[in-house]
Interface confidence: medium
Amino acid sequence: MSSKYPRSVRRCLPLWALTLEAALILLFYFFTHYDASLEDQKGLVASYQVGQDLTVMAAIGLGFLTSSFRRHSWSSVAFNLFMLALGVQWAILLDGFLSQFPSGKVVITLFSIRLATMSALSVLISVDAVLGKVNLAQLVVMVLVEVTALGNLRMVISNIFNTDYHMNMMHIYVFAAYFGLSVAWCLPKPLPEGTEDKDQTATIPSLSAMLGALFLWMFWPSFNSALLRSPIERKNAVFNTYYAVAVSVVTAISGSSLAHPQGKISKTYVHSAVLAGGVAVGTSCHLIPSPWLAMVLGLVAGLISVGGAKYLPGCCNRVLGIPHSSIMGYNFSLLGLLGEIIYIVLLVLDTVGAGNGMIGFQVLLSIGELSLAIVIALMSGLLTGLLLNLKIWKAPHEAKYFDDQVFWKFPHLAVGF
């Protein structure tokens, strides 16, 4: 029997998504305008290229990275694109409202698009923990809540803790990870009998997931340096991220082999661990004074990532219902924390080295910032999870988890493709 999109969702999704899109168009009509002035052409091209790198990371990198399920690869890629497109629109408006609204108009620049893409990336990281268990209507809710929560978190951190754009955006790693994990915790967990095979990875989708990892690997330096304004900080960020991800690749592949009794390399470990270094240096990439430190961080991050991939999935599968191959959530939660700790250590060394007092105060501020990010992520994640459990969204039946055929029209319906 052909597997149609359930009738109720067929009514609910287009109506919900198109009404939302119409509302966004109206908001853009009334409240936004382009930056009308002539920017210098060289700066414009450079700024656009960074934005393009971020879009490639989001659409291709994260899109394909999450596509390793045997029967859920189409949905992973396309739903990611859908969320990115929606998330960027809402993030531009939200960021404008939060920072510029007293004027009644939001000015859209390439910088604001870059910022919005990074905010939308947060959703794509979080959603890895729930993909396959939710439909598009539910994902729309998740996008709206998470982008709103992140936007407000960034604004609060900027105003209370006096941090710059780069710093308050680099909480994205821990925020996205904890948000995704708390949403997953709220969703129905047990996989009914007979569907266990669907959350297994297959060779071709695994290859596309590796392609996603490669795109992320190539463009991670752009992500970590995107919001830094000083050329020297930007250069430091690019170099340090590059060294860190380079070392984490070597560590991931050799560590994966080391972790296997027969010395075999696990695709799942490699997918996530190659990115470990980029996440770990994210917060402090502009402050790290020399390459060897970034490389050591990449090594530690790679080992943590492989270790986590080996020992945490069992626990996450039982407690949160997250499949073995969706390890981005707990990976980023561990590595994001590592990155924040490294930043605090560097801040202390920097403060001591400068002969500047108030070390305790600086550390306290950093811990406060991190705690706030985690608390808001958990609270907004739980709220989202509760919202997604509402009957109105017609969530896929547990027997239909991780199944493209629920959502897509295939010319000939076959179980394997």
């Epitope: 930056d35 002035s37 920017e39 210098d40 700066g43 920072s99 000015v107 620049t109 910088f111 604001s112 900027s158 105003n159 803790f161 006096n162 941090t163 710059d164 754009y165 780069h166 710093m167 308050n168 919001l227 304004r229 000083s230 050329p231 020297i232 900080e233 502009h286 402050l287 801040l347 920097d350 403060t351 400068a354 002969g355 500047n356 600086q362 501020l365 950093s366």
Partner: antibody, heavy 126, light 108 residues
């Protein structure tokens, strides 16, 4: 109490040189980015140059590039502005400014001018 | 080029907003706008940094924000002693900081 005191101003002929100095008291210069700003008589403020806490990066306004050099001596808590090939349009009061407290996240690279000296007058005239 | 209103007049107790525009485009938080007050014969004094952050010595009646692609300084409940020249400063990345031309505020 944070205080900045400039010195070295005076009258000089076009093409001549001067070296402005500034000493800081109440805090250590090696913590912060330092700037020189000038104000021509009856005109507005013009940012001239900056140097980072460790001297690793310097910046100059286009009109003084190649003629002015900013430097610092952290051991003496001093910052200097060496001005060569002076022109009539360099006539101004030169203020020295510093960042009093670091912005977290870019703690090393500060572009805020919290504390200002009283200024020293440079007159370029024949 | 950074542009400010050449002069503004306000009554004591009134509210006035000074703006700061950049010729390269909309001013965002990433320009880290600063505002300074300078009274005749005195050195400038910092009021606002990083768009809206106040120094410990900045009176509560001064506030910074972004308005329609410009940096803005709002004075609420203007006092006679607020009569001065006000300058904004924008950071353009790398080694470029640029002051605005200044706004002469007259309190009548």
């Amino acid at each position: 109490q944070v205080k900045l005191l400039e010195s070295g101003g005076g009258v000089v002929q076009p093409g001549g040189s001067l070296r402005l100095s500034c000493v800081a008291s109440g805090f250590t210069l090696r913590s912060y980015g330092m700037h020189w700003v000038r104000q021509a008589p009856g005109k507005g403020l013009e940012w001239v140059a900056f140097i980072w806490f460790d001297g690793s990066n310097k910046g100059y306004v286009d009109s003084v590039k190649g003629r002015f050099t900013i430097s610092r001596d952290n051991s003496k808590n001093m910052v200097y502005l060496q001005m060569n090939s002076l022109r009539a349009d360099d006539t101004a009061v030169y203020y020295y400014c510093a960042r009093e407290k670091a912005l977290r996240g870019i703690s090393r690279y500060n572009y805020y001018l919290d504390v200002w000296g009283k200024g020293t007058t440079v007159t370029v005239s024949s | 080029v950074v542009t400010q209103e050449p002069s503004l007049t306000v009554s004591p107790g009134g509210t006035v907003t000074l703006t700061c525009a950049s010729s390269t485009g909309a001013v965002t938080r990433g320009y880290y706008p600063n505002w300074f007050q300078q009274k005749p014969g005195q050195a400038p004094r910092a009021l606002i940094y990083s768009t809206n952050k106040k120094h410990s010595w900045t009176p509560a009646r001064f506030s910074g924000s972004l308005l329609g692609g410009k940096a803005a300084l709002t004075l609420s409940g203007v006092q006679p002693e607020d009569e001065a020249e006000y300058y904004c400063l924008l950071y353009y990345g790398g080694a470029q900081l640029v002051f605005g031309g200044g706004t002469k505020l007259t309190v009548l």
